[in-house]
Interface confidence: medium
């Protein structure tokens, strides 16, 4: 049935899917607060531009009776059920914010003829790449893959003089939603990462990982895993690690590394942490108090989704253009808008660009230090610390294959 969009005559509505199954276990109240905070700013921006219009959000809740796993496993049907609810109510906003699970986003995109934009805080998987009306406001797996390939190939930095072409990937199936799809992308045999590497093996058991740490016959010195330091400690403990092992710990949505009083534990000395630049982290705002750093990023993505809609609405209204058109639905990409804590850039496919930061543990200070940054928008690495105080020999990252000479 044809669903009418509440999106004209000076009244513009945002449909926010409040799904029980979510990329991060965040109380829906916090997401509501984030959306309401965003609405307040959008109204101010539109008013400042002389646009006397009404912008509101409608929160669509699922009944939670059937799809109650709380994680993303049963999100596919929940997303479609919510769309059915919208269809039955014959009421849809100008834009759909949510869902965050890759499964639900993929299925909703596939099963609906959407003539409106969909904004997601999540949907990390490769299956959500290159969707014409989907915008993703948290770094998707594709961005991680491009960084890793870029870093593997780099061989002209004072601290990295070897190109790498091998890796182990640790993936045991208990990962969070973001990590699950990041590692899934690295594992996929048809992905860019797999295509560019000569050797890649997935370690699925704790024992496999632990054995590699001291195995003289290992095929690579590099192990990629995803999670926080505590996750690594549970796995690695205080076991001895061969001196040329490098663990890459992907922990994008965690800015605890940048807090002043944080000391890196000893087990992190062989580890490079890949995280996002903290930017203007949100402290004590209505939707982020009492949140973990990860959840703060999730709530912020919801808020920025509202600001993005406001940005596009302003442009279209100022140009006298209709909002309920395919042109509007396809416009949420290749742009920069003013996010809550600074400019947010979206690439040609509507995916957020960001600055990734690679950290190492200084053997002198036991602090996390920035080794390099990587701009996902231009696919370029920028060294920061030209003489890092590494644990590795000669303060250089080792070759990825033991015993192999200079490349």
């Amino acid at each position: 049935s044809q669903v009418s969009q509440n999106c004209h005559n000076g009244s513009y509505e945002i449909s926010v899917l409040m799904m029980g199954n979510s990329a991060f276990a965040e109380p829906l109240k916090n997401l509501e607060d984030a959306v309401n905070e965003g609405l307040e700013i959008v109204r101010g921006r539109l008013q400042n531009a002389g646009l006397n219009v009404t912008v509101n959000a409608t929160f669509m809740y699922s009944d939670g009776l059937i799809h109650n796993s709380g994680d993303c496993r049963s999100s596919t049907c929940e997303g479609l059920d919510l769309l059915r609810k919208i269809s039955n109510a014959q009421r849809m906003g100008c834009v759909l914010i949510g869902p965050s699970c890759t499964y639900s986003t993929f299925q909703m995109y596939l099963d609906t003829e959407l003539s409106y934009p969909m904004i997601s805080a999540g949907s990390f998987g490769l299956s959500c790449d290159y969707k014409e009306t989907l915008t993703r406001l948290m770094s998707p797996a594709r961005k991680l893959m491009y960084f890793l390939v870029n870093f593997w190939k780099t061989n002209d930095l004072p601290f990295k003089t070897y190109s790498w072409s091998t890796s182990y990937v640790y993936k045991n199936g208990t990962e969070t939603e973001d990590c699950f799809w990041y590692l899934n992308a690295l594992e996929a045999s048809v992905s860019y990462f797999s295509h560019e590497l000569g050797f890649k093996v997935v370690l699925r058991q704790d024992k496999e990982f632990q054995d590699i740490l001291m195995d003289h016959n290992r095929k690579s010195n590099v192990i990629i895993m995803c999670g926080g330091p505590e996750f690594l400690y549970k796995l690695k403990g205080d076991r001895a690690v061969a001196e040329d092992i490098v663990i890459i710990l992907v922990d994008l949505f965690n800015d605890q590394y940048f807090e002043d009083n944080v000391t890196a534990p000893d087990y992190m000395k062989n580890v490079l942490v890949l995280t996002l630049s903290p930017g203007n982290s949100l402290l004590n705002s209505s939707f982020s108090r009492n949140l973990s750093p990860t959840k703060r990023d999730f709530a912020l993505a919801y808020l920025n989704g509202i600001l993005l809609f406001g940005h596009m609405l302003k442009i279209f209204l100022e140009n006298g253009e209709n909002i309920t058109t395919p042109k509007f639905a396809h416009a949420f990409r290749n742009l920069t808008f003013e996010g809550y804590d600074g400019p947010v850039t979206l690439d040609d496919w509507g995916d957020v660009d960001s600055t990734m930061v690679l950290l190492y543990t200084s053997v002198d200070t036991k602090k996390y230090k920035v080794l390099l940054t990587y701009d996902t928008h231009v696919n370029k690495t920028y060294p920061v610390d030209m003489s890092p105080t590494f644990t590795w020999k000669n303060s250089k990252l080792p070759n990825d294959i033991t015993g192999r000479g200079p490349q």
Partner: nanobody, 115 residues
Framework: QVQLVESGGGLVQPGGSLRLSCTAS????????MSWVRQAPGKGLEWVAK????????YYVDSVKGRFTISRDNAKNSLYLQMNSLRAEDTAVYYC????????WGQGTAVTVSS
């Protein structure tokens, strides 16, 4: 820990002016949006004005537009509210906050507009 100290309130006649100040500590002030919030006697909290971390955006409740100006000095960790053409209905305790529903509050500064 986060601390906010408001000052500058007082008794003023209708049509008069006051400048409120708020000094912040315990967090990186220059990274966050800041707000002024007020509570009139016997009433609930009302958001008054809001300013972006770099001062690039400012928003006001309709009732104070054109009369109040919010500003900040990140080098001094300070937030200001210049209040002109004051009216009796502006009488309230004024608080600064990083957000109007947040948990940490200063003691506020009382503004009384009366002849």
């Amino acid at each position: 820990q986060v601390q906010l100290v408001e000052s500058g309130g007082g008794l003023v006649q209708p049509g008069g002016s006051l400048r409120l100040s708020c000094t912040a500590s315990g967090f990186t002030f220059s990274r966050y949006w800041m707000s002024w919030v007020r509570q009139a006697p016997g009433k609930g909290l009302e958001w008054v004005a809001k300013i972006r971390h770099d001062g690039g955006e400012k928003y006001y409740v309709d009732s104070v537009k054109g009369r109040f100006t919010i500003s900040r000095d990140n080098a001094k960790n300070s937030l200001y509210l210049q209040m002109n053409s004051l009216r009796a209905e502006d009488t309230a305790v004024y608080y600064c906050a990083t957000d109007y529903t947040r948990d940490v509050w200063g003691q506020g500064t009382a503004v009384t507009v009366s002849s």
